[in-house]
Interface confidence: medium
C-alpha cells in the first residue's frame, strides 16, 4: 500500500511566491511619468515575474515633517486619484497580484514616525488601516519601526485590525536593524507579522557565515513563517558585490519563507549607477531610452528589454526561479535541512512528503570548489541520491536537465546550483 500523503499546511497567498516593492512610483516608471494609471500598464510585466504581491508606496499626502499636513487617507495627487487606485486594485486582482500599501507616515521627512507625536500618528495609522482595508487592499507595510516608540504594542494593535478584517490580509514591518534579538522581540508579539530587516546584509558573504545566519534566524524564529531580503527597502546591489547577485537570487527564492525584492533587483539595477540619479530610488531601466538625457548611458544588457531577450540574463534567472518557487511543493512549504559541504559552500535540501525534492548548493567563494556534500548531517527522510538533475545554474555553460553526479560535484566561483531529484519510498 502506498504511504499516506502528508497533510498540506494552510497556505496564505504570500506563502506562494515573491513580493515586489515599488517604493517610488515615478522612478519605477521612468522620468516624470510615474502615476497609478501608468503602473496599471506595467502589471503584465509583474505577472511575467510571477510575483504574488506588490508592495506599493507610500502614496499618501505627506508634507515633509508636518503631521498636520500628512493625510494617510488621501492619495497625493502627483500619483493619481483614489479612482486610479481602485482601478489599479481591480486590474491587479484580475492578474492575481495582491496589493500591499505602504503607510509609513513621514516618508518625505527626516523621522519617518514624527518621533515627538507618536500617539497622534498611531491613531492616524489605525484609521488608515480600516479605511484602506475597506477600499480593498491586501495588506500594509510600515518601515523604520525601530524609530517607533513601543513598536511591538503598536504592531500588535495594527495586526489585530488587519487580521480582524480578514486572515487573508498581511502586515509587513520593516526595520534597519540587523540584530537578531531585536528582530525576534518584534516578532514575538505578532504571530503573523512579516518582518523585513538588514539581518542578512550584516554578512561577510561567505558560505559558512551565511549558513550560520540563516540557521540562527530559523532556530530563533521557530516554526513561524519568515521573509527573506537584504533590507527593508533597498536594492540588492546596494548590499552585494555584483558577482553574488545571482547566488543570492537563488538563495532568497529557495529558503523557507517569502522572498521580498525591490523593483530593479531582477535586472541588477544599481543605485546611483547613472549620473544625476537619487541613490535611494534609481530610475528603472526599461529600455535604452530610459535615460534620454545621456545618450549611450544605458546599454541593452542593463535593461528589461535587453535582458528579456537573453536567456542567460539575471532577469531570465529571476523568472525561472520565481516560476519554480510558485509551483513546486517542496519549495512552497517543504522542510529545510542544511548540511556540511565544505569551506565556502552553503548547501541545503528542500523536501515535502513524496514530492520532487530540491538540492541547493551555493559557492560563495571566488575559487572553484568541489562540493563535499556531507549527507550524514541529514535526517533519513531527506537523504541524497547518487545523481540529481540540474534545474538551473547561476552561471552559463551547464545543460539544464542534465544529471549531475553528486559524488563529483564541482562548482565554479560564485556558482549556485538548483538540482532536483525524485522521492524514493
Amino acid at each position: 500500500r502506498a504511504p499516506r500523503c502528508r497533510e498540506l499546511p494552510a497556505q496564505k497567498w504570500w506563502h506562494t511566491g515573491a513580493l515586489y516593492r515599488i517604493g517610488d512610483l515615478q522612478a519605477f516608471q521612468g522620468h516624470g511619468s510615474g502615476n497609478l494609471a501608468g503602473l496599471k500598464g506595467r502589471l503584465d510585466y509583474l505577472s511575467s515575474l510571477k510575483v504574488k504581491g506588490l508592495v506599493l508606496g507610500p502614496l499618501h499626502k505627506n508634507q515633509k515633517d508636518d503631521v498636520a499636513q500628512t493625510d494617510l487617507l488621501q492619495i497625493d495627487p502627483n500619483f493619481g486619484s483614489k479612482e486610479d487606485f481602485d482601478n489599479l486594485l481591480q486590474s491587479a486582482k484580475k492578474k492575481s497580484i495582491r496589493v500591499i500599501l505602504d503607510l509609513t507616515p513621514n516618508y518625505r521627512g527626516e523621522n519617518l514616525w514624527f518621533s515627538t507625536q507618536v500617539d497622534s500618528v498611531a491613531t492616524k495609522v489605525k484609521d488608515a488601516l480600516e479605511f484602506w482595508l475597506q477600499a480593498g487592499v491586501d495588506g500594509f507595510q510600515v518601515r523604520d519601526i525601530e524609530n517607533l516608540k513601543d513598536a511591538s504594542s503598536f504592531l500588535a494593535e495594527w495586526e489585530n485590525i488587519t487580521k480582524g478584517f480578514s486572515e487573508d490580509r498581511l502586515l509587513i514591518a520593516g526595520t534597519n536593524s540587523s540584530d537578531l534579538q531585536q528582530i525576534v522581540s518584534l516578532l514575538e508579539s505578532n504571530k503573523d507579522l512579516l518582518l523585513t530587516s538588514s539581518y542578512l546584509s550584516d554578512s561577510s558573504f561567505t558560505g559558512e557565515h551565511t549558513k550560520s545566519l540563516v540557521t540562527q534566524y530559523l532556530n530563533a524564529t521557530g516554526n513561524r513563517w519568515c521573509s527573506w531580503s537584504l533590507s527593508q527597502a533597498g536594492l540588492l546591489t546596494s548590499f552585494l558585490p555584483a558577482q553574488l547577485l545571482r547566488l543570492y537570487q537563488l538563495m532568497l527564492f529557495t529558503l523557507p519563507g517569502t522572498p521580498v525584492f525591490s523593483y530593479g533587483d531582477e535586472i541588477g539595477l544599481k543605485a546611483a549607477a547613472l549620473p544625476g540619479q537619487p541613490v535611494e530610488a534609481p530610475v528603472m531601466l526599461w529600455d535604452e531610452s530610459s535615460f534620454p538625457d545621456i545618450p549611450g548611458a544605458v546599454s541593452a544588457n542593463m535593461t528589461v528589454k535587453g535582458q528579456s531577450e537573453d536567456p542567460g540574463s539575471l532577469l531570465s534567472l529571476f523568472r525561472q526561479l520565481s516560476d519554480q518557487r510558485s509551483k513546486e511543493r517542496s519549495l512552497l512549504h517543504g522542510d529545510f535541512h542544511t548540511f556540511s559541504s565544505g569551506p565556502g559552500l552553503f548547501s541545503y535540501i528542500r523536501h515535502w512528503d513524496q514530492n520532487e525534492r530540491f538540492l541547493v548548493v551555493l559557492n560563495f567563494g571566488d575559487v572553484g570548489l568541489s562540493a563535499g556534500l556531507q549527507a550524514s548531517d541529514l535526517p533519513a527522510s531527506a537523504s541524497l541520491p547518487t545523481k540529481a538533475d540540474l534545474v538551473l545554474s547561476t552561471q552559463p555553460g551547464r545543460e539544464e536537465g542534465s544529471p549531475l553526479e553528486l559524488e563529483r560535484l564541482k562548482l565554479e566561483p560564485h556558482e549556485g546550483l538548483l538540482l532536483r531529484f525524485p522521492y524514493v519510498a
Partner: antibody, heavy 118, light 112 residues
C-alpha cells in the same frame, strides 16, 4: 558520539561464509555512502566495496566480485558485508568507513578480524 | 585498475628534520573539473587509518600544518616540515578517481 563499530568477524573454514556488520551511531547512516576496506596481517590497505546512500548502487574489487555482497539496513543504521566462498587470502582486518561526498573517508571503524583457515 | 606506487617504503627520520614521501599513479588522477582525486592517510600502530590530506593538497581538519600535499596528474608528494615522535606509522596514498579505489603499498616512517 559519532562512530562506526564492526562485528561478525571470526574463524571460518575455506569455502565458508560470514556476515560482517557495521553499526553506525551519532549520525544517520541512510544519508551516507559507505565502504569496506581490508588489511591483511602486516600488509597494506585494500579497498573492498562501496554502497550508495539508498542501496541502489554498489561496486566491488575484482578479487571479491561474485563472492561478497554489500548491503545496508537504514532502519537499523547498519551496514553489512556478506562474504561467501571464503578463501585464505580473505584473511584480514575488515574496516567499514564513511565516505564524505566527493572528498574522502572521514570516519573509520576499529575493524573486525576475519580469519579463513582449515 | 589504477596502480599506485609509493617510495620510499621505509623512511627513518630524525625528529625535527623534514620528510618527504612520493606517490605515483599509473594514470592521471586529475578530474576534468580540476581536482586531483588523491588522499593521504596515516595509520599509527594499532589504530585505524586517519586522513591527512584530501584532493591532493587540502589538509583535513585537525591535521597539523607541518603536513602538506602537492602534485598533480600522476605525481604527488606528502611533506612533513618537521617530524615529531607522534608522526610514526605507515603513510598511504589512495586514489578515489574511480573504482576500484586503490592504495599505495605504504611508507613506514620510523624515528632514528
Amino acid at each position: 558520539e559519532v562512530q562506526l563499530v564492526e562485528s561478525g568477524g571470526g574463524l571460518v573454514q575455506p569455502g565458508g561464509s560470514l556476515r560482517l556488520s557495521c553499526a553506525a551511531s551519532g549520525f544517520t547512516l541512510s544519508s551516507s555512502w559507505m565502504h569496506w576496506v581490508r588489511q591483511a596481517p602486516g600488509k597494506g590497505l585494500v579497498w573492498v566495496s562501496r554502497i550508495n546512500s539508498d542501496g541502489s548502487s554498489t561496486s566491488y574489487a575484482d578479487s571479491v566480485k561474485g563472492r561478497f555482497t554489500i548491503s545496508r539496513d537504514n532502519a537499523k543504521n547498519t551496514l553489512y558485508l556478506q562474504m561467501n566462498s571464503l578463501r585464505a587470502e580473505d584473511t584480514a582486518l575488515y574496516y567499514c568507513a564513511r565516505w564524505n561526498w566527493g572528498w574522502y573517508f572521514d570516519l573509520w571503524g576499529r575493524g573486525t578480524l576475519v580469519t579463513v583457515s582449515s | 585498475d589504477i596502480v599506485m606506487t609509493q617510495s620510499p617504503l621505509s623512511l627513518p627520520v630524525t625528529p625535527g628534520e623534514p620528510a618527504s614521501i612520493s606517490c605515483r599513479s599509473s594514470q592521471s588522477l586529475l578530474h576534468s573539473h580540476g581536482d586531483n582525486y588523491l588522499d593521504w592517510f596515516l595509520q599509527k600502530p594499532g589504530q585505524s587509518p586517519q586522513l591527512l590530506i584530501y584532493l591532493g593538497s587540502n589538509r583535513a581538519s585537525g591535521v597539523p600544518d607541518r603536513f602538506s600535499g602537492s602534485g598533480s596528474g600522476t605525481d604527488f608528494t606528502l611533506k612533513i616540515s618537521r617530524v615529531e615522535a607522534e608522526d610514526v606509522g605507515v603513510y598511504y596514498c589512495m586514489q578515489t578517481l574511480e573504482t576500484p579505489y586503490t592504495f599505495g603499498q605504504g611508507t613506514k616512517l620510523q624515528i632514528k
